[in-house]
């Protein structure tokens, strides 16, 4: 993965109550199933419609889950992480890292590679160009007066 991706990273504590069909999301990652280059963390790959996580509304696809009920998810095999979630009980506390991508490049945490967010340069370049055109037109107008 070359290039640079800038993120606005925020952390949040999310408390979920296990629903009839569990926690209502899918996970990827682990030391044996890296989802992100050089990161064996656990990520949310899918939110189940009308599941516990979807009804709560805060957990998003692409979020990194740092801990479950205070237990760190670092350096776990994928299946060990799955078992941790499945045995976490009725009330589950998740420490979650949200990442908002603010500049394009190779996608860091979205495995399927769909760019989320608009690259800054795509906004700045047209704005700068418009400013220059407006300044030039203004100067021409002043010279004619």
């Amino acid at each position: 993965m070359n290039g640079r991706v800038d993120y606005l990273v925020t952390e949040e504590e999310i408390n979920l109550t296990r629903g009839p069909s569990g926690l209502g999301f899918n996970i990827v990652g682990g030391t044996d199933q890296q989802y992100v280059s050089n990161d064996s963390g656990i990520y949310v790959s899918r939110i189940k419609e009308n599941g516990a996580a979807a009804l709560d509304g805060r957990l998003q696809e692409g979020d990194k889950i740092l801990s479950v009920n205070g237990q760190d998810l670092k350096n776990l095999l994928h299946q060990d992480a799955v078992d941790l979630f499945r045995n976490a009980g009725y009330a589950v506390s998740l420490r979650v890292q949200h990442r908002l991508q603010v500049q394009n490049g190779p996608i860091g945490h979205r495995g399927e590679g769909d760019p989320s967010g608009i690259p800054i340069f795509m906004v700045l370049v047209p704005v700068f160009a418009l400013t220059m055109v407006a300044a030039w037109a203004f100067m021409r107008y002043r010279q004619q007066l």
Epitope: G22, L23, N26, D32, S45, R46, V82
Partner: nanobody, 125 residues
Framework: QVQLVESGGGLVQAGDSLRLSCAAS????????MAWFRQAPGKERDFVAT????????NYADSVKGRFTISRDNAKNTVTLQMNSLQPEDTAVYYC???????????????????WGQGTQVTVS
């Protein structure tokens, strides 16, 4: 573009065997939970079998346990369903399905899967 393409269906006699294959493209296959479902005429789509990302964990519908075997090859992006001792009640269109990651909800509901193949017809006479 995600594509799941099934093959291997056909017309067989009761007691015969058949091997269905599903070739996946457009996804990072090794991250996906894969499954087979089937739909008989006039009936709902039913769960047949599922397999986790590494192939180490499988789950089967009671009606096919001991007769059907699901497997996967992550190097070739394929999932297969070996069907033995086929019975007339196994007649259906068989669908391959996939979803990213491991579910913490369940894997037997068609709504748990995002991607589907077009299906392959299996007829047991």
């Amino acid at each position: 573009q995600v594509q799941l393409v099934e093959s291997g269906g056909g017309l067989v006699q009761a007691g015969d065997s058949l091997r269905l294959s599903c070739a996946a493209s457009g996804i990072t296959f090794r991250w996906y939970t894969m499954a087979w479902f089937r739909q008989a005429p006039g009936k709902e789509r039913d769960f047949v079998a599922t397999i986790n990302w590494s192939g180490s964990d499988t789950n089967y519908a009671d009606s096919v346990k001991g007769r059907f075997t699901i497997s996967r090859d992550n190097a070739k992006n394929t999932v297969t369903l070996q069907m033995n001792s086929l019975q007339p009640e196994d007649t259906a269109v068989y669908y391959c399905a996939g979803v990213p990651g491991t579910s913490l909800s369940g894997e037997t509901d068609p709504r748990d899967y995002d991607y589907w193949g077009q299906g392959t017809q299996v007829t047991v006479s």
